[in-house]
C-alpha cells in the first residue's frame, strides 16, 4: 500500500511523528549539532515505523537546505534482506552512514567540514518492497560550523581625487570583528560593513582614505582565534604598490 506523509507533529526534541490506527512513524533528530571547520560531525537520526519485520528494499537519504526538495548529499540502498546499505551518492566523498538503517538508524558523519556546510540537514527513509512507504524529517538538524577567522582578501584600490582606500575581507563563525592599524591610524574599526548578502560568514572592513605611506594591517578576531594580514602603500609619483 502507498502512503505519503503530510501531517506531522513535532515536540521540542525534534521528534517527528505520524500516527494512524496501529501505525506509527517517527524520526528523532537533535535540533542542532556544532563542530569546527576541518573537523568531522555526526548528524544523529533514528526512526520508528509501523511495518514490523520489514526486510525489503530500503533507501536512506540525506538532504541539505530544505526538506523534500533540497539537494541530496547522501544516498544509499539496501537490497531485500541485506543489511549492507550500498552508497550511491556521497557529496565530495565526505558523507558516511554511521547508523544501520535496518536497525532504524540513519546517523551520518560529515568529514572535513567547511563553513559552506553550515545548513540544515534532513534524513529520509524509503521502503520499496511489498510495502511502499517513506518518511522524512521535516525540521531536520542544523549543522552549525564554527571557524577561526581567515582573511580571504586584502587590497589597496584607487579612489577619487588621487587617493587610495584599503579593503579587508575575512570569514569566520562567529563572524569576526575587523580592525585596521597603520600609519597615523592607531587601531580603528574603520567602517566595518555588515556581512555580505548571501555570504553570512564574510565581513568586510574599509579604510576609506590612506593618508600616509607605510604598512596597513587588518586584524580579524573571534572567539576561536585571530588572523592578520598587511598591505603596503608606497606612492611614487601617484602610483601605488600593494603586497600582502
Amino acid at each position: 500500500f502507498v502512503r505519503t506523509k503530510i501531517d506531522t507533529t513535532e515536540n521540542l526534541l525534534n521528534t517527528e511523528v505520524h500516527s494512524s490506527p496501529a501505525q506509527r512513524w517517527s524520526m528523532q533528530v537533535p535540533p542542532e549539532v556544532s563542530a569546527e571547520a576541518g573537523d568531522a560531525a555526526v548528524l544523529p537520526c533514528t526512526f520508528t515505523h509501523p511495518h514490523r519485520h520489514y526486510d525489503g528494499p530500503l533507501t536512506a537519504i540525506w538532504r541539505a537546505g530544505e526538506p523534500y526538495a533540497g539537494p541530496q548529499v547522501f544516498r544509499c540502498a539496501a537490497a531485500r534482506g541485506s543489511e549492507l546499505c550500498q552508497t550511491a551518492l556521497s557529496l565530495h566523498g565526505r558523507f558516511r552512514l554511521l547508523g544501520n538503517p535496518r536497525r532504524n538508524d540513519l546517523s551520518l558523519r560529515v568529514e572535513r567540514l567547511a563553513l559552506a556546510d553550515d545548513r540544515r540537514y534532513f534524513c529520509r527513509v524509503e521502503f520499496a518492497g511489498d510495502v511502499h512507504d517513506r518518511y522524512e524529517s521535516r525540521h531536520g538538524v542544523r549543522l552549525h560550523v564554527t571557524a577561526a577567522p581567515r582573511i580571504v582578501n586584502i587590497s589597496v584600490l584607487p579612489s577619487p581625487a588621487h587617493a587610495f582606500r584599503a579593503l579587508c575581507t575575512a570569514e569566520g563563525e562567529p563572524p569576526p570583528a575587523l580592525a585596521w592599524s597603520g600609519p597615523a591610524l592607531g587601531n580603528s574599526l574603520a567602517a566595518v560593513r555588515s556581512p555580505r548578502e548571501g555570504h553570512g560568514h564574510l565581513v568586510t572592513a574599509e579604510l576609506p582614505a590612506l593618508t600616509h605611506d607605510g604598512r596597513y594591517t587588518c586584524t580579524a578576531a573571534n572567539s576561536l582565534g585571530r588572523s592578520e594580514a598587511s598591505v603596503y602603500l608606497f606612492r611614487f609619483h601617484g602610483a601605488s604598490g600593494a603586497s600582502t
Epitope: D39, C85, D105
Partner: antibody
Framework: QVQLVQSGGGVVQPGRSLRLSCAAS????????MHWVRQAPGKGLEWVAV????????YYADSVKGRFTISRDNSKNTLYLQMNSLRAEDTAVYYC?????????????WGQGTLVTVSS | QSVLTQPPSVSVAPGKTARITCGGN??????VHWYQQKPGQAPVLVIY???DRPSGIPERFSGSNSGNTATLTISRVEAGDEADYYC???????????FGGGTKLTVL
C-alpha cells in the same frame, strides 16, 4: 595527521586485570567508532570489540564477552580496554583502530600495538 | 557468523601478478576490506569496500568481489610487497568484524 598512541601493556598473571589505553589525535575522535583488534604470537588478526562514536553501542567477540569492557572518554580523546579475568590465551599484541568507513566499515588507522603477556 | 578462508601462502616472482583469495558464503553481498602487515608492524589498509584504494596505496593493488570469493590482486609484484595479507568483513547478524586467517605472500 591521524595518530593512535597506545599504552598499558605488560606482563600479568592469569586471573588478574589490565587496562589498555589508546590516545587519539589529528581527527575528531568523537565522530568515529573505535575498535580493539589483537594478534597472538605467530597467529592472525582477531577482532576484539567495537564502541560507537558516542559510546552508546558496544559489541564484543565471543572469546572476550563478559571479561573485557571497551569504553571511551571523548573529552580526553582516549579509548580504553579493561581486561579482567585474563587467561593465557589472551596473550597477544593488542591494536586500537579507527573505523574509517560506514557502520560496516574498515580500519583505516591503527595504533602501534601493545603486548599483553598473561603468564604465571 | 561469517567464516573467511584464505590460502596460508602464495608465492610469486618479481614483476608477476599475485592473487590472494578470500572465500566465504555469499561474500559477494558483503563489503570486503584487505590489510597488509609486515613483520613487527601494525596492519595497513590496502583495499576497502571490495575495490577502493586508500590514498598512498599504489595502483598495482586492486580488489574484486563476487559470488563466494573476494580477490586481492597485486600486479607487477615487488620485493617490498612481501607481507601477510588479511581480508575482513562485517558480520551483520552479530555486528562483529571478522578477519580471514591471513595469507603470507612470498616474493621469490
Amino acid at each position: 595527521q591521524v595518530q593512535l598512541v597506545q599504552s598499558g601493556g605488560g606482563v600479568v598473571q592469569p586471573g588478574r586485570s589490565l587496562r589498555l589505553s589508546c590516545a587519539a589525535s589529528g581527527f575528531t575522535f568523537s565522530s568515529y567508532a573505535m575498535h580493539w583488534v589483537r594478534q597472538a604470537p605467530g597467529k592472525g588478526l582477531e577482532w576484539v570489540a567495537v564502541i560507537s562514536y558516542d559510546g552508546s553501542n558496544k559489541y564484543y567477540a565471543d572469546s572476550v564477552k563478559g571479561r573485557f569492557t571497551i569504553s571511551r572518554d571523548n573529552s580526553k580523546n582516549t579509548l580504553y580496554l579493561q581486561m579482567n579475568s585474563l587467561r593465557a590465551e589472551d596473550t597477544a599484541v593488542y591494536y586500537c583502530a579507527r573505523e574509517g568507513g560506514s557502520y560496516y566499515g574498515y580500519f583505516d588507522y591503527w595504533g602501534q600495538g601493545t603486548l599483553v603477556t598473561v603468564s604465571s | 557468523q561469517s567464516v573467511l578462508t584464505q590460502p596460508p601462502s602464495v608465492s610469486v616472482a618479481p614483476g608477476k601478478t599475485a592473487r590472494i583469495t578470500c572465500g566465504g558464503n555469499n561474500i559477494g553481498s558483503k563489503s570486503v576490506h584487505w590489510y597488509q602487515q609486515k613483520p613487527g608492524q601494525a596492519p595497513v589498509l590496502v583495499i576497502y569496500d571490495d575495490s577502493d584504494r586508500p590514498s598512498g596505496i599504489p595502483e598495482r593493488f586492486s580488489g574484486s568481489n563476487s559470488g563466494n570469493t573476494a580477490t586481492l590482486t597485486i600486479s607487477r609484484v615487488e620485493a617490498g610487497d612481501e607481507a601477510d595479507y588479511y581480508c575482513q568483513v562485517w558480520d551483520s547478524s552479530s555486528d562483529h568484524r571478522v578477519f580471514g586467517g591471513g595469507t603470507k605472500l612470498t616474493v621469490l
